[in-house]
């Protein structure tokens, strides 16, 4: 049969509120060298126990009896400290444990989760969380909005999660936790009501250097909108603005619009250029979220100036004309050049030269037409740019370089088709 337990004093019980400090104590009487006393909580050796051991000899000889007292200090009682405590000693080849003592927690409810401050769009549903525990259980929750209870009694209304169908003004929320020991009140969360995200951002009109955009404002609760902010950023295929990407990759062009009207003219833009735009509206409580980025594009314009450095020389029934691209902005993709020539008493002849910058003309009437002038204009998909001033055809003088003659051909079909002017085809043999 087992030897008699050396324990003469067993741990007591401790029950208290969180943060309490207490001590468990056990005492044993042993013969010979005193053993180390270990503490168990729910069968598990406490490795980092705050314990002290005191040993008092009862006689002169080491082999006499000793009284050993071990004290375990629990500082700032927590739920994790609760359980059954025992002392444990290894004596020779035997193991002894004391009778158990119990540590319990009992006090006002303790919050595991409290409502947090947040922003919400006006009239938009959201949830708040609150969680509390004892012991003692049960713990019943009571939600308050602007200090007004949302239920008749604790435990009757929503508990861990409060669903708010929407707010039209900034409000405060808190929760009370009730148990047999009393009431604890959570922090107060401020829920700030911001305007809803604007909707239906769209283009009203487009011009090569400006876009007019409009949108529908979202609800903003009791707070009128003070202004809306529009951002535009150049889109680049490699830029990576996705539908909901939060930040543009470069500094956007930002404009503020007084509201109403919910419309804004964005000027000083590049023609024939893709942009992404978004809008947010602000009330006294703060700004709404941005709309998704909307891809838009300024249209092409016509070239702003005529071709440059036009020269025209004549040699008998042939005329050689060449020019350079306009220096003025093209406002789009250059599709080609139109050339017009006219004699003093002859009708004007219009030609589409395509993208070449020189042409050899076969003149009718064996070169007898007098006072011939040539005009050239550049064109984009949006139309013709201004015509150059008429350039007179100069007679070719020996010593001048003979021009390289090229056939006047129909240009390759452009990406956009336009109503063609009457083309004259002159074949040079």
């Amino acid at each position: 049969q087992a030897e008699e337990s050396p324990f003469v004093g067993n741990p007591g019980n401790i029950t208290g509120a969180r943060g309490l400090t207490g001590t468990l104590r056990c005492q044993l009487q042993v013969q010979g060298e005193p053993p180390e006393v270990h503490w168990l909580r729910d069968g598990q050796i406490l490795e980092l126990a705050d314990s002290t051991q005191t040993q008092v000899p009862l006689g002169e000889d080491e082999q006499d009896d000793w009284i050993v007292v071990s004290q375990l200090r629990i500082t700032s009682l927590q739920l994790s400290d609760t359980g059954q405590y025992q002392c444990l000693v290894f004596l020779g080849h035997q193991t002894f444990v004391s009778q158990p003592g119990y540590v319990g927690l009992e006090g006002l409810p303790y919050f595991l989760e409290e409502p947090e401050d947040r922003t919400v769009a006006a009239n938009t549903p959201f949830n708040l969380s609150c969680q509390a525990q004892g012991p003692p259980e049960p713990v019943d929750l009571l939600w308050l909005q602007d200090a007004v209870p949302l239920a008749t009694a604790p435990g009757h209304g929503p508990q861990r999660s409060l669903h708010v169908p929407g707010l039209n003004k900034t409000s405060s929320f808190s929760c009370e936790a009730h148990n047999a020991k009393g009431v604890t009140t959570s922090r107060t969360a401020t829920i700030t009501v911001l305007p809803q995200q604007p909707r239906n951002l769209h283009l009203v009109s487009r011009q090569p250097t400006e876009l007019e955009v409009a949108w529908t404002p979202g609800l903003s609760g009791i707070y009128p909108l003070t202004h809306c902010t529009l951002q535009a950023v150049l889109s680049d295929d490699g830029m990576g603005i996705q539908a909901g990407e939060p930040d543009p990759p470069e500094e956007p062009l930002t404009s503020q619009a007084s509201v109403p009207p919910h419309q804004l003219r964005l000027g000083s833009l590049h023609p024939h250029t893709p942009y992404h735009i978004r809008v947010a509206c602000t009330s006294s409580q703060g700004p709404s979220s941005w709309t998704h980025w909307l891809p838009v594009e300024t249209p092409e314009g016509v070239p702003l100036g005529p071709p440059e450095n036009i020269s025209a020389t004549r040699n008998g029934s042939q005329a050689f004309v060449h020019w350079q691209e306009p220096r003025a902005p093209l406002q789009g993709t250059l599709l080609g050049y139109r050339l017009a020539y006219q004699g003093q008493d002859t009708p004007e002849v219009l030609m589409d030269i395509g993208l070449r910058q020189e042409v050899t003309l076969e003149l009718q009437g064996d070169g007898s037409v007098s006072n011939l002038t040539v005009c050239v204009a550049a064109y984009t998909a949006a139309g013709d740019g201004p015509w150059s001033l008429p350039v007179p055809l100069e007679a070719w003088r020996p010593g001048q370089a003979q021009p390289v003659h090229q056939l006047v051909k129909e240009p390759s079909t452009p990406a956009f088709s336009w109503p063609h002017h009457h083309h004259h085809h002159h074949h040079h043999h």
């Epitope: 337990s5 270990h38 069968g43 598990q44 050796i45 490795e47 025992q86 444990l88 009778q99 158990p100």
Partner: antibody
Framework: QVQLVQSGAEVKKPGASVKVSCKAS????????INWVKQAPGQGLEWIGW????????KYNEKFKGRVTLTVDTSISTAYMELSRLRSDDTAVYYC?????????WGQGTLVTVSS | EIVLTQSPDFQSVTPKEKVTITCSAS?????MYWYQQKPDQSPKSLIY???NLASGVPSRFSGSGSGTDYTLTINSLEAEDAATYYC?????????FGQGTKLEIK
């Protein structure tokens, strides 16, 4: 001396329950925790849970919670483990073991075979 | 849960040799325990509180270590030491065991 003697081998069908006993002697039964440990064929050791005979308090490994029930009868110094809704992967040797912060004494083991 | 990894999984040794088995924990622990299990027998406590010999265990067995790394040493191996050895922790719940090291005598 401390001894833990377990009940004999069992063969059960899937979905059935099994109850294994562990009789303790040689020490004050109500002072020490009784643990149960599983060892599947050719496998290692897996802790199932403990019971404190003095109070009947129990603690279970999450993996076994809901299917295992630990009980004691202090009048005959015997601990029991009941495993319900048996599956083929419950086939194993089940050991009871006394604990003093570790498993200082073990029963001889009970083989439970689950087979249809 | 804390995972214990033993090394090696298997070792074949000759009598009188010194054997070292290591056990590595996935988190720091305070104490390690070691058990011996012979074929068709139940496990038997060998070392407790990292370095204390359990009742009846020969002095050729010893344990050491701290933190995450622990060692079981058998000085001058004997034929009767052929068994599987398991390390175990109970620093946090649930208590867990290593996968075992099988020791074979040549």
């Amino acid at each position: 001396q401390v001894q833990l003697v377990q009940s004999g081998a069992e063969v059960k069908k899937p979905g059935a329950s099994v109850k294994v006993s562990c009789k303790a002697s040689g020490y004050p039964f109500t002072d020490f925790y009784i643990n149960w440990v599983k060892q599947a064929p050719g496998q290692g050791l897996e802790w199932i849970g403990w019971i404190y005979p003095g109070s009947g308090n129990t603690k279970y490994n999450e993996k076994f919670k809901g299917r295992v029930t630990l009980t004691v009868d202090t009048s005959i110094s015997t601990a029991y483990m009941e495993l319900s809704r048996l599956r083929s992967d419950d086939t194993a040797v089940y050991y009871c073991a006394r604990s003093t912060g570790f498993f200082d004494y073990w029963g001889q083991g009970t083989l439970v075979t689950v087979s249809s | 849960e804390i995972v214990l990894t033993q090394s090696p999984d298997f070792q074949s040794v000759t009598p009188k040799e010194k054997v070292t088995i290591t056990c590595s924990a996935s988190s720091s622990i305070g104490y390690m325990y070691w058990y011996q299990q012979k074929p068709d027998q139940s496990p038997k406590s060998l070392i407790y509180l990292t370095s204390n010999l359990a009742s009846g265990v020969p002095s050729r067995f010893s344990g050491s270590g701290s933190g995450t790394d622990y060692t079981l040493t058998i000085n001058s191996l004997e034929a009767e030491d052929a068994a599987t050895y398991y390390c175990q922790q109970w620093s946090s719940n649930p208590p867990t065991f290593g996968q075992g090291t099988k020791l074979e005598i040549k």
